[in-house]
């Protein structure tokens, strides 16, 4: 990947990722330097007859670093702080080839929940105010609410009226997605409105 346009690589928090390295064809490599945010990460001297010399220069990531046979960088047990710019410099007798990468770490979505603040009007219409959330949501998480295949909201929140006299039983599903995972959670309008109705009758008595 040329230094002008870094290859963007997605990693999943806690899992492993490989930054692929392509060798100049037919040239003998003298050494390879891997950098993270312009700080040296590792220095590798390949040998034709024996194992390569690998000098890990960043102790912070050192124990989680590995290299493939082609000296691609493997980073395991990914942490959010691994996000950033990586560069590999391959030095041959005649040239130096630079490969650039941008690593971003994404979380697998976890613990989807729906909170409900619904109210019943005197005409027995039930107004549902639903809010969907996932653990540690960031700006890369997309939320939407669906019913019968139609998108009713493109946000974590859904406001919708439901009239039990004219509407059949209806499920509302929140879908949370990012580039590496998706979760969904369904709620029944009938059930939610029955709960509100019980509360409503209790307060009236």
């Amino acid at each position: 990947q040329s230094s002008l346009t870094p290859l963007m690589v997605n990693g999943i928090l806690g899992e492993s990722v490989t930054l692929p390295l392509e060798f100049p064809a037919g040239e003998k490599v003298n050494f390879i330097t891997w950098l993270f945010n312009e700080t040296s990460l590792a220095f590798i001297v390949p040998h034709e007859t024996k194992s390569p010399e690998i000098h890990v220069t960043n102790p912070k990531q050192g124990k989680r670093l590995n290299f493939t046979q082609s000296y691609s960088l493997q980073l395991s047990n990914l942490k959010m702080e691994d996000t950033g710019s990586y560069r590999a410099q391959i030095s041959t007798k005649t040239s130096a080839k630079l490969s650039s990468y941008t690593l971003r770490i994404l979380r697998q979505l976890r613990n989807i929940q729906v909170t409900n603040h619904s109210q019943l009007f005197q005409n027995m219409t039930c107004e549902l105010h639903l809010t969907c959330s996932v653990e540690d949501a960031d700006d890369n998480v997309s939320f939407r609410w669906e019913a019968l295949g139609n998108t009713l909201s493109s946000q974590p929140n859904l406001t919708v009226s439901w009239d039990p006299r004219i509407s059949s039983e209806q499920d509302y599903t929140c879908i949370a997605e990012n580039a590496v995972s998706n979760l969904s959670f369904s709620v029944s309008a009938q059930k939610l409105c029955e709960d509100v109705k019980i509360q409503y009758t209790d307060t009236k008595m």
Epitope: R144, S154, T159, E177, A179
Partner: antibody, heavy 118, light 106 residues
Framework: QIQLVQSGSELKKPGASVKVSCKAS????????MNWVRQAPGQGLEWMGW????????RYADDFKGRFVFSLDKSVSTAYLQISSLKAEDTAVYYC???????????WGQGTTVTVSS | QIVLSQSPATLSLSPGERATLSCRAS?????MHWYQQKPGQAPRPWIY???NLASGIPARFSGSGSGTDYTLTISSLEPEDFAVYYC?????????FGGGTKVEIK
């Protein structure tokens, strides 16, 4: 039917401010995020950011942090884009666009041309 | 940010010909959306989530792809198809658009 209607063209001097409106109709305004997209003359589309129409919370793309402000008036189902300290390079067509989910913009305003010239 | 590169920048074809528009992402994305824009008009939604045609879009249009490579195909160009087409990704903020492919009459 569902539509977004934007305010008319604006001619402003450098350093001035402008406020573009986007009035939504035909759907529940607070259920769908509103995005803003810029198109400079002869150029492509640039996503500026979006505003959560339920909470009123805006999110800006890095290039649009500072002089650009998204706001709402839920009572009239309208989203606003305000640009302060206008520069010549702000000359563009500004679009509002509804997010139908997964940041798919299924309904667009007709666009508002903002020209900044001394 | 994820950079979307559209190719070719301009496609010169005659009505009835097949058009293949490419959109390459600098990182893997889950889905791609496509929009059509004609001069002096707002963009129109064309294809969402890689392969689903927006309402009223004729079946001669199709979308495909995964990972970093996505394609919009027009099986047989009609006069009204000559326009600029933009791809857009949603997997990562900021939501980015490609630079556009102009389909023009040869």
């Amino acid at each position: 039917q569902i539509q977004l209607v934007q305010s008319g063209s604006e001619l402003k001097k450098p350093g001035a401010s402008v406020k573009v409106s986007c009035k939504a109709s035909g759907y529940t305004f607070t259920n769908y995020g509103m995005n803003w997209v810029r198109q400079a003359p002869g150029q492509g589309l640039e996503w500026m950011g979006w505003i959560n129409t339920y909470s009123g919370e805006p999110r800006y793309a890095d290039d649009f942090k500072g002089r650009f402000v998204f706001s709402l008036d839920k009572s009239v189902s309208t989203a606003y884009l305000q640009i302060s300290s206008l520069k010549a390079e702000d000359t563009a067509v500004y679009y509002c666009a509804r997010d139908y989910g997964r940041w798919y913009f299924d309904v667009w305003g007709q666009g508002t041309t903002v020209t900044v010239s001394s | 940010q994820i950079v979307l590169s559209q190719s070719p920048a301009t496609l010169s074809l005659s009505p009835g010909e097949r058009a293949t528009l490419s959109c390459r992402a600098s990182s893997s994305v889950s889905h791609m959306h496509w929009y059509q824009q004609k001069p002096g008009q707002a963009p129109r939604p064309w294809i969402y989530a890689t392969s689903n045609l927006a309402s009223g879009i004729p079946a001669r249009f199709s979308g495909s792809g995964s990972g970093t490579d996505y394609t919009l195909t027009i099986s047989s160009l009609e006069p009204e198809d000559f326009a600029v087409y933009y791809c857009q990704q949603w997997s990562s903020t900021p939501r980015t658009f490609g630079g556009g492919t102009k389909v023009e009459i040869k």
